[in-house]
């Protein structure tokens, strides 16, 4: 399977909210002994590989923001902890998962990564990630609403 990032760049005004999205593509094994772990974190375009470094989003680590379920179940993160930080990550039945960030500030600007781990018990973990940039702007040049820019290549790099 792969991860698609429909948009590679989100440009938003301060105070707005944004929903960053990733989508699972391709054959997804829904077998009994396969489960999925999905999460979000901030990163940098590192020397070795984009998304290899995992930084917190508003002080919440990728452990705090993870989603866990079988191949075809919807899931949400621990609501209270995330909502206190103006965050919510969610996943639907169709392979799409997202993180919503409310009340954006300039400090939210940066590179965001979604990570999907297909856990094939008795065999291995299969990791794929997607990356997108968030730019939060202020002042007269800032847009009135979020503007999104489609990815030139929607498939993320498969890193297994």
């Amino acid at each position: 399977f792969k991860v698609a990032t429909p948009y590679s760049l989100y440009v938003c005004p301060e105070g707005q909210q944004v929903t960053l999205t990733c989508r699972l593509l391709g054959p997804v094994d829904k077998g009994h002994d396969v489960t999925f772990y999905k999460t979000w974190y901030r990163s940098s375009r590192g020397e070795v590989q984009t998304c290899s470094e995992r930084r917190p989003i508003r002080n919440l680590t990728f452990q705090d923001l993870h989603l866990h379920h079988g191949g075809h179940q919807a899931a949400n993160t621990s609501h209270d902890l995330a909502q206190r930080h103006g965050l919510e990550s969610a996943s639907d039945h169709h392979g799409q998962f997202s993180i919503t960030m409310r009340n954006l500030t300039l400090l939210d600007s940066g590179l965001y990564c979604c990570l999907v781990v297909e856990i094939r018990h008795h065999h291995s973990e299969h990791r794929v990630h997607g990356a997108m940039e968030l730019q939060v702007q202020t002042g007269k040049d800032a847009p009135s609403n979020c503007v999104v820019y489609p990815s030139s290549s929607q498939d993320s790099e498969n890193i297994t």
Epitope: D33, Y37, H68, S78, L115, V117, H121, H122, S124, E125
Partner: antibody
Framework: QVQLQESGPGLVKPSETLSLTCTVS????????WSWIRQPPGKGLEWIGY???????NYNPSLKSRVTISVDTSKSQFSLKLSSVTAADTAVYYC???????????WGQGTMVIVSS | EIVLTQSPATLSLSPGERATLSCRAS??????LAWYQQKPGQAPRLLIY???NRATGIPARFSGSGSGTDFTLTISSLEPEDFAVYYC?????????FGGGTKVEIK
């Protein structure tokens, strides 16, 4: 802050079954892998196996025929059973949280189990 | 299973010196390798994950590098609390395996 605490008998007779329990406090057991790792005196670390929150298990092939790991989410506990023990099973047994695509980030303090008659 | 070989088995150094520890895998583990520190009577503590990322709260003097089969943990300037045993661990597939450890002792 998640903490792990192992409990169980410190002495087991040869051929009997070693039974240990790990209690998870300060966080949910309903996610991640929950693993057992052991360390014989003066030696290195050996992964025994895990139970995933969903109930799926995975054991080290070298111990698979003797190992059972189970979980009781209502008590926030997971347990290890190792049958037909010998002196070679004498070790410090650790429980640990293992996060997918990450590492063993939280460990119990370990419990010494001696196999002797 | 993947065998991890650590060298040297023992490293005798003085505080302030640089420590370089090696871990070699019997087959490629990509960059899915962690490093742990263990002091006598204590559980291991995670230092590095994915070959070069420091875990939360780990001082900058600890750094990891490498990919494929050859990895290095470097302690740029040894502090008294750094004298311990260090283990590498792979997670590209199961069973998860650890190296035999490198003991960093005071010279």
């Amino acid at each position: 802050q998640v903490q792990l605490q192992e409990s169980g008998p410190g002495l087991v007779k040869p051929s009997e079954t070693l039974s240990l329990t790990c209690t998870v406090s300060g966080g949910s057991i309903s996610s991640y892998y929950w693993s057992w790792i052991r360390q014989p005196p003066g030696k290195g670390l050996e992964w025994i196996g895990y139970i995933y929150y969903s109930g799926s298990t995975n054991y080290n092939p070298s111990l698979k025929s003797r190992v059972t790991i189970s979980v009781d989410t209502s008590k926030s506990q997971f347990s290890l059973k190792l049958s037909s023990v010998t002196a070679a099973d004498t070790a410090v047994y650790y429980c640990a949280r293992d996060i997918p695509a990450f590492a063993f980030d939280i460990w119990g303090q370990g419990t010494m189990v001696i196999v002797s008659s | 299973e993947i065998v991890l070989t650590q060298s040297p088995a023992t490293l005798s150094l003085s505080p302030g010196e640089r420590a370089t520890l090696s871990c070699r895998a019997s087959q490629s583990v990509s960059y899915y390798l962690a490093w742990y520190q263990q002091k006598p009577g204590q559980a291991p503590r995670l230092l590095i994950y994915d070959a070069f990322n420091r875990a939360t709260g780990i001082p900058a003097r600890f750094s990891g590098s490498g990919s494929g089969t050859d990895f290095t943990l470097t302690i740029s300037s040894l502090e008294p609390e750094d004298f311990a045993v260090y283990y590498c661990q792979q997670r590209i597939n199961w069973p998860l395996t650890f190296g035999g450890g490198t003991k960093v002792e005071i010279k």
